[in-house]
Amino acid sequence: DTEIKVNPPQDFEIVDPGYLGYLYLQWQPPLSLDHFKECTVEYELKYRNIGSETWKTIITKNLHYKDGFDLNKGIEAKIHTLLPWQCTNGSEVQSSWAETTYWISPQGIPETKVQDMDCVYYNWQYLLCSWKPGIGVLLDTNYNLFYWYEGLDHALQCVDYIKADGQNIGCRFPYLEASDYKDFYICVNGSSENKPIRSSYFTFQLQNIVKPLPPVYLTFTRESSCEIKLKWSIPLGPIPARCFDYEIEIREDDTTLVTATVENETYTLKTTNETRQLCFVVRSKVNIYCSDDGIWSEWSDKQCWEGEDLSKKTLLR
């Protein structure tokens, strides 16, 4: 009774299609696979960025897999063939592992790469990234930004740079069609006649770096002798009402400061008839139903009521 064996996949490799971190892992079937023609052979693939504690594990019948990686670090991956128990009279058979690595040969010392990279997706409409030049680089150093997300045929270069002293220190992006809820990849590389410049890679999802506009049309309405309803409108733009959280700051008679976080465009405040002055401001942020993270908007303009009975009128800014 001969022991059943299976070979590892052939030519296991990590292919960089030029998408700034979105890589293809691909392989060929093992030799002698047709011994198991009646069986569906599977592959167990493990991969990670070098330095990561944990492997991602995939089991697939395909000969390729695609995922995003941090190209600032190397990548390691391994794969083996799995013969299910149905093919082998009772126990799963695994091949030995085939292993491969990938990294971009770094140019220049780490200090030459851009510093303090910051990207904000203003009002879910306009992406702007800014950075500071690397430490100790000369004024002849220029940085170039490239970006890619699924849906683009190839990586694109920024066409509208923000400049300071002749150096590119930021990028205003064009309209980015169908670019949210997917990984957005950026590479900022550089050139200098003096020394090589280290490239930097960044990955994020646009909906997680949205900074909305502040709310507008703040109003007061007296609901009862001891309740005032504060109301406002969602900021203009493409973000739907269901996507907002709000933070309110209320000041009563220059003394009491109330802060609250709410999900709707209203807030009911308990007051006394003695209240002489009431002011509030509101800011907005994309909530957990629409993103994993976000940036608070600027505060709205302040809306105040002063020295008049709130029951007599609604104050509209």
Partner: antibody, heavy 118, light 107 residues
Framework: QVQLVQSGAEVVKPGASVKLSCKAS????????MSWVRQAPGQGLEWVAT????????YYPESVKGRFTITRDNSTSTLYMEMRSLRSDDTAVYYC???????????WGQGTLVTVSS | DIVMTQSPLSLPVTLGQPASISCKAS??????VAWYQQRPGQSPRALIY???YRYSGVPDRFSGSGSGTDFTLKISRVEAEDVGVFYC?????????FGQGTKLEIK
């Protein structure tokens, strides 16, 4: 349908270099390994080089190692072979071929005649 | 290197009759053998992979068999279009190697 279209015939002097190309269409080029096989006049087939789909792996027989280089450009679906320090016994028809998923060669180009002669 | 030895080197056959070509490997190549046909003035064409599996479009009069070191290509009824040279090839290990070819001609 799968097509492999090779560049035209070459006549070169001994010691010279030449670069052959093979333009692929009708399949996802980057998913397949590719090979070059040659056939000297009146002789049989001789394997010359293989490259993996992503280009990470290259294989050569001893007879051409160090002189021939197989490369590919997946963005243009083109396979290349650069041949240096050519000798008269390199005279042959050179075929590009797609390596199928079992590692055999399932589709072949029309061939390029390379003549090395002084 | 693995040497693939074909026999016979020349095979005259009467139309409609069967033909058989043998290919012996100098060491075990499991089932990792392919067969090719090269008609006069044409590029090679793949017939068989993994010793016994026909490529799509290959007539079922062609069949392959064998494993380890001994392999056979059979043509059940030879037709005029089968004229040419048949090659076996092993892909079990690099360097890939071909047999020297068997020339099939019509008697």
């Amino acid at each position: 349908q799968v097509q492999l279209v090779q560049s035209g015939a070459e006549v070169v002097k001994p010691g010279a270099s030449v670069k052959l190309s093979c333009k692929a269409s009708g399949f996802t080029f980057s998913s397949y390994g590719m090979s070059w096989v040659r056939q000297a006049p009146g002789q049989g087939l001789e394997w010359v080089a293989t490259i993996s789909g992503g280009g990470s792996y290259t294989y050569y027989p001893e007879s051409v190692k160090g002189r021939f280089t197989i490369t590919r450009d997946n963005s243009t679906s083109t396979l290349y072979m650069e041949m240096r320090s050519l000798r008269s016994d390199d005279t042959a028809v050179y075929y590009c071929a797609r390596r199928d998923l079992r590692s055999a060669m399932d589709y072949w180009g029309q061939g390029t005649l390379v003549t090395v002669s002084s | 290197d693995i040497v693939m030895t074909q026999s016979p080197l020349s095979l005259p056959v009467t139309l409609g009759q069967p033909a058989s070509i043998s290919c012996k490997a100098s060491q075990n190549v499991d089932i990792n053998v392919a067969w090719y046909q090269q008609r006069p003035g044409q590029s090679p064409r793949a017939l068989i992979y993994s010793a016994s599996y026909r490529y799509s479009g290959v007539p079922d009069r062609f069949s392959g068999s064998g494993s380890g070191t001994d392999f056979t290509l059979k043509i059940s009824r030879v037709e005029a279009e089968d004229v040419g040279v048949f090659y076996c090839q092993q892909y079990n290990a690099y360097p890939l190697t071909f047999g020297q070819g068997t020339k099939l001609e019509i008697k």
